[in-house]
């Protein structure tokens, strides 16, 4: 008799999840010499230990601490690029602007990017059928808690001038319910971070609006200023200049050093 299984509203664990995490870890540590010491089997064991046999609505940041410890990584704190609702372009940017880093350019972010995972209470099985949806089921699910944990740590590590790429084509350019708005903004350290500079990326070719005057940007400015961090906003046009660089990442046009 097949055992009854909880049906969640979200998609199930990404197929071949263990193999994918392990393979990504091996690839990352091969490419990044400073992480060559990392034992990928231990990383997988710690990752698995965070959610296997646990109720997928009762995951805590504490569950991920062993993984966090193994994935400890130092990135230049003044070269951090945060993003909200514009992941692909942010990644294209750091792909070519090699001295800047998004969370997904770090080991832990790279391991989990675009993946879904969850387990079941009291069984060692991974649930490939469904996982909790953040809105419809619960917020303390394995994926949400993971990203909250790594995002908080990433923001805490930032210093000097921190950049954030925002999507100027969305109705809410700054969304206080996004990971950036709900986690990262509140974990930038005023003692270390001098300025948050927002890059508002325009979509339309003929767009000449000043999106830095958008009410949601004013809201972001207010939040940041109250935290004693300076705020700057820049309109960024012609994002096709980024896309060209993805085709030719080695090209000299793909670095801001003139």
């Amino acid at each position: 008799v097949p055992r009854w299984r909880q049906q969640w509203s979200g998609p199930g664990t990404t197929k071949r999840f263990p193999e994918t995490v392990l393979a990504r870890c091996v690839k990352y540590t091969e490419i990044h010499p400073e992480m060559r010491h990392v034992d990928c089997q231990s990383v997988w064991d710690a990752f698995k230990g965070a959610f296997i046999s646990k109720h997928p609505c009762n995951i805590t940041e504490e569950d991920y601490q062993p993984l966090m410890k193994l994935g400890t990584q130092t990135v230049p704190c003044n070269k951090i690029l945060l993003w909200s609702r514009i992941k692909d372009l942010a990644h294209q940017f750091t792909q070519v602007q090699r001295d800047m880093f998004t969370l997904e350019d770090t080991l832990l972010g790279y391991l989990a990017d675009d993946l879904t995972w969850c387990g079941e209470f009291n069984t060692s099985k991974i649930n490939y059928q469904s996982c909790p949806d953040w809105r419809k089921d619960c917020s303390n699910n394995p994926v949400s808690v993971f990203w909250k944990t790594v995002s908080r740590r990433f923001a805490e590590a930032a210093c000097d001038v921190v950049h954030v790429m925002l999507n100027g084509s969305r109705s809410k350019i700054f969304d206080k319910n996004s990971t950036f708005g709900s986690v990262e903004v509140h974990n930038l350290q005023p003692e270390k971070v001098q300025t948050l500079e927002a890059w508002v990326i325009h979509g339309g070719r003929e767009d000449s609006r000043d999106l830095c005057q958008d009410p949601t940007i004013k809201e972001l400015e207010s939040i940041i200023s109250k935290r004693n961090i300076q705020f700057s906003c820049k309109n960024i046009y012609r994002p096709d200049k980024f896309l060209q660089c993805v085709k030719n990442p080695e090209d000299s046009s793909c670095t801001s050093e003139i």
Epitope: V96, R205, D210, Q213, D240, K241, S253
Partner: antibody, heavy 120, light 107 residues
Framework: QVQLVESGGGLVQPGGSLRLSCAAS????????MNWVRQAPGKGLEWVSA????????YYADSVKGRFTISRDNSKNTLYLQMNSLRAEDTAVYYC?????????????WGQGTLVTVSS | DIELTQPPSVSVAPGQTARISCSGD??????VYWYQQKPGQAPVLVIY???KRPSGIPERFSGSNSGNTATLTISGTQAEDEADYYC??????????FGGGTKLTVL
């Protein structure tokens, strides 16, 4: 090193046409937005036109829209400016300029310029 | 379209600090670029992205941008810095604008 060399300037009557060229070398031409900027005698700089790396996107200043056409031939590393219905106020030194990368929109390198004189 | 306003001229004694302003509505929301042009020569980029210096440009050149005003600062001005200086910004589409230029005289 980066080199931009303009040619094609000269004396032309009002209403006439002229085609400027800019030969680029020392960088991957097909990876950059390119621009034309002009400077009337004793006056300031005025941006004229821009073209994307693949030539699909073109921008023009209001003062030249409908009269000037920017184009490029990436196989020849050459930028062009076709100028029609020329007016006396188009008299200027015309510079070819290479765009800055990524989030920046300014001019990293300039040619030495070619003089266009519109007079009867 | 944004309009950029520069003082027509600025004078400075050698070794002193020269400041050239460039003002426009909400200029802080756009990156500003500065060019140096000597008589009979093409312009040269001296500052990009508000405050970044291209390689080969002396450290005495610096830039800032806040409120409605961007400023080019030349500390320890030298005779060779005498030139016309232009600010420039881009506000999307076909809106790429230069300031009217400032003639810097080193006394």
């Amino acid at each position: 090193q980066v080199q931009l060399v303009e040619s094609g300037g000269g004396l032309v009557q009002p209403g006439g046409s002229l085609r400027l060229s800019c030969a680029a070398s020392g960088f991957t031409f097909s990876s950059y937005y390119m621009n034309w900027v002009r400077q009337a005698p004793g006056k300031g700089l005025e941006w004229v036109s821009a073209i994307s790396h693949d030539g699909n996107v073109k921008y023009y200043a209001d003062s030249v829209k409908g009269r000037f056409t920017i184009s490029r031939d990436n196989s020849k590393n050459t930028l062009y400016l076709q100028m029609n219905s020329l007016r006396a106020e188009d008299t200027a030194v015309y510079y070819c300029a290479r765009d800055l990368p990524l989030v920046y929109t300014g001019f990293a390198y300039w040619g030495q310029g070619t003089l266009v004189t519109v007079s009867s | 379209d944004i309009e950029l306003t520069q003082p027509p001229s600025v004078s400075v004694a050698p070794g002193q600090t020269a400041r050239i302003s460039c003002s426009g509505d909400n200029l802080r929301h756009y990156y500003v670029y500065w060019y140096q042009q000597k008589p009979g020569q093409a312009p040269v980029l001296v500052i990009y992205g508000d405050s970044k210096r291209p390689s080969g440009i002396p450290e005495r050149f610096s830039g800032s941008n806040s409120g409605n005003t961007a400023t080019l600062t030349i500390s320890g001005t030298q005779a060779e810095d005498e030139a016309d200086y232009y600010c420039q910004t881009y506000t999307g589409g076909a809106s790429l604008v230069f300031g009217g230029g400032t003639k810097l005289t080193v006394l």
